[in-house]
Interface confidence: low
């Protein structure tokens, strides 16, 4: 027969869960022991793996609520394909029964006395109500019994006496004008307001009680403008340190508008809240140093050869710097004094040139003369040998970078009659005066 | 006057480390240049590492590059050189120096020297 097929089995509820399908058979749907089937929507789920027990359901409650009866609980053989110990087959349900006991005793009514007498009516004047009570002893009830019915009942009374009225009073008049149009002066403002007890009065006979409280009331005035205060100076403060250490520096004064502070519109104090003086600590501020420009770079020479130029043999040069202006001890200039790199020298080379595109136009000369022209060449551009790029000078040190150094001496072709730089020029139009721009100014 | 003591040298073999200190006293400016110097028997003197005191600029011999380190402790007034992966050719007298001027590197005309300590590396 067709089954439903699910992919788990919940141990815990002994529920299918993940509906894979129906339709299909029990011996397909189990090919993986982790399904599970149920023969019909709702019915008992089975597990595929092999049977076993299921774990004892809770107990089901007592069959009394009172004294001795019997509960019963149960477990069910389940999975496919085999038995449970004691050869049962899956499905099968095998129960324990045992007794228990929730309330030892069952519970038994109880019986009422006679009613007891009329307590006083509720109130000393008009209507109100008395009440009178029975108790549940005639039997007492027995194992958490009761009496049937209620314990006590009210009629109505009547005392046949009039209440007397009450005072009450009526509603506050309006607050009357301030004492004052500011607060904080000699005299705290106040404002006062008044009620009268005649809602309603209290009655003559019987006699009411008069109102409780005061007839009348006073509070400070709210919402007033505080009264202005004018500011006063407090006195000099200390002189502040030097604030530099060397060179001249400025101290300062300080005084506070706070004797006393000026208050709600009260004038701040007439006056400066600083003085300043100036300080010398006669001590020269120290100057650091700084590098001059490189100098120029120098021949590019190998130790023990008289001449590298226009060879293929990688040499030295150095350039220096000066570290200049360096005064009372201020700082010394950082890094090397020295620039090392290797080259190969091209001084004085006849090399192999060609002529470079136009330069850019350059700067109009004189700026400030008369006939101002502008410029642009064409160099005659020697072509650089091909070098090693890079050396090896020791052993295990690691390549270096070899620079071209010294004036070659290129050849081309002439141009415009010309062997190494060819010029053309212009004159610049519409110039502006040179002027001073700080005249220009005033 | 200025005095550099050094220490911490020793015999090691070929692969181990050493920590070699130098004690200054007597140095009042704030700048300058320390440096460590060494010298094999029957070779020059030569610069080994430098640093600029109370800053971090250095510079190292090729030779010794990634291997050693030099530090200060300005607090304590103390120069360090730790010397790891040693070899046989690190066999030397070991020199702190000093001075006010620049540029920091290993050229030998510094103006104040320890008495030195011996380094030997085995093989």
């Known amino acids: 027969d067709p089954v439903l097929c699910f992919t788990q089995y919940e141990e815990s509820s002994g529920k299918c869960k993940g509906l894979l399908g129906g339709g299909v058979s029990v011996e397909d749907c189990c090919l993986n022991t982790a399904f599970a089937y149920q023969k019909r929507s709702g019915g008992l789920c089975q597990p595929c793996r092999s049977p076993r027990w299921s774990l004892w359901s809770t107990w089901a409650p007592c069959s009394v609520t009172c004294s001795e009866g019997s509960q019963l609980r149960y477990r069910r053989c389940v999975g496919w394909n085999g038995q449970c110990s004691g050869k049962v087959a899956p499905g099968t349900l095998e129960w324990q029964l045992q007794a228990c006991e929730d309330q030892q005793c069952c519970p038994e009514m109880g019986g009422w006395s006679g009613w007891g007498p009329w307590e006083p009516c509720s109130v000393t004047c008009s209507k109100g109500t008395r009440t009178r009570r029975r108790a549940c002893n005639h039997p007492a009830p027995k194992c958490g019994g009761h009496c049937p019915g209620q314990a006590q009942e009210s009629e109505a009374c009547d005392t046949q006496q009039v209440c007397p009225t009450h005072g009450a009073w009526a509603t506050w008049g309006p607050w009357t004008p301030c004492s004052a149009s500011c607060h904080g002066g000699p005299h705290e403002p106040k404002e006062t307001r008044s009620r009268k007890c005649s809602a309603p009065e209290p009655s003559q006979k019987p006699p009411g009680k008069p109102c409780p409280g005061l007839a009348y009331e006073q509070r400070r005035c709210t919402g007033l403008p505080p009264c202005p205060v004018a500011g006063g100076w407090g006195p000099w403060g200390p002189v502040s340190p030097c604030p530099v250490t060397c060179g001249l520096g400025q101290t300062m004064e300080q005084r506070t508008c706070n004797h006393p502070v000026p208050q709600h519109g009260g004038p701040f104090c007439a006056g400066d809240a600083t003085r300043t003086h100036i300080c010398n600590t006669a001590v020269p501020c120290p100057v650091d140093g700084e590098w001059d420009s490189w100098g120029e770079w120098s021949p590019c020479i190998r130790r023990n050869m008289k001449s590298i130029s226009c060879q293929e043999i990688p040499g030295q040069q150095s350039r220096g710097r000066t570290c200049r202006g360096r005064k009372f001890d201020g700082h010394r200039c950082a890094g090397q004094q020295q620039d090392i790199r290797h080259c190969y020298s091209i001084q004085h080379c006849p090399l192999k040139g060609s002529w470079s595109e136009w330069s850019t136009w350059g700067l109009c000369m004189p700026p400030c003369g008369p006939n101002p022209t502008r410029a642009r060449q064409r160099l005659c551009t020697p072509l650089l040998p091909k070098y090693p790029p890079t050396v090896s000078m020791v052993e295990g040190q690691g390549e270096k970078n070899v620079t071209f150094w010294g004036r070659p001496l290129p050849r081309c072709e002439e141009l415009q009659g010309q062997k190494l730089v060819v010029e053309e020029k212009r004159p610049c139009l519409h110039v502006p005066a040179c002027k001073d721009p700080e005249e220009e100014e005033l | 006057q200025v005095q550099l003591v050094e220490s911490g040298g020793g015999s090691v073999h070929a692969g181990g480390s050493l920590r070699l200190s130098c004690a200054v006293s007597g140095y009042t400016h704030s700048t300058g240049c320390m440096a460590w110097f060494r010298q094999a028997p029957g070779k020059e003197r030569e610069g080994v590492a430098s640093i600029i005191r109370g800053e971090r600029g250095e510079w190292y011999a090729d030779s010794v590059k990634g291997r050693f380190t030099i530090s200060q402790d300005n607090a304590e007034n103390t120069l360090y050189l730790q010397m790891n992966s040693l070899k046989s050719e690190d066999t030397a007298m070991y020199y702190c120096?000093?001075?006010?001027?620049?540029?920091?590197?290993?050229?030998?005309?510094?103006?104040?020297w320890g008495q030195g300590t011996q380094v030997t590396v085995s093989s």
């Open positions: 120096a000093a001075d006010y001027r620049y540029p920091c590197d290993g050229r030998s005309n510094y103006d104040y």
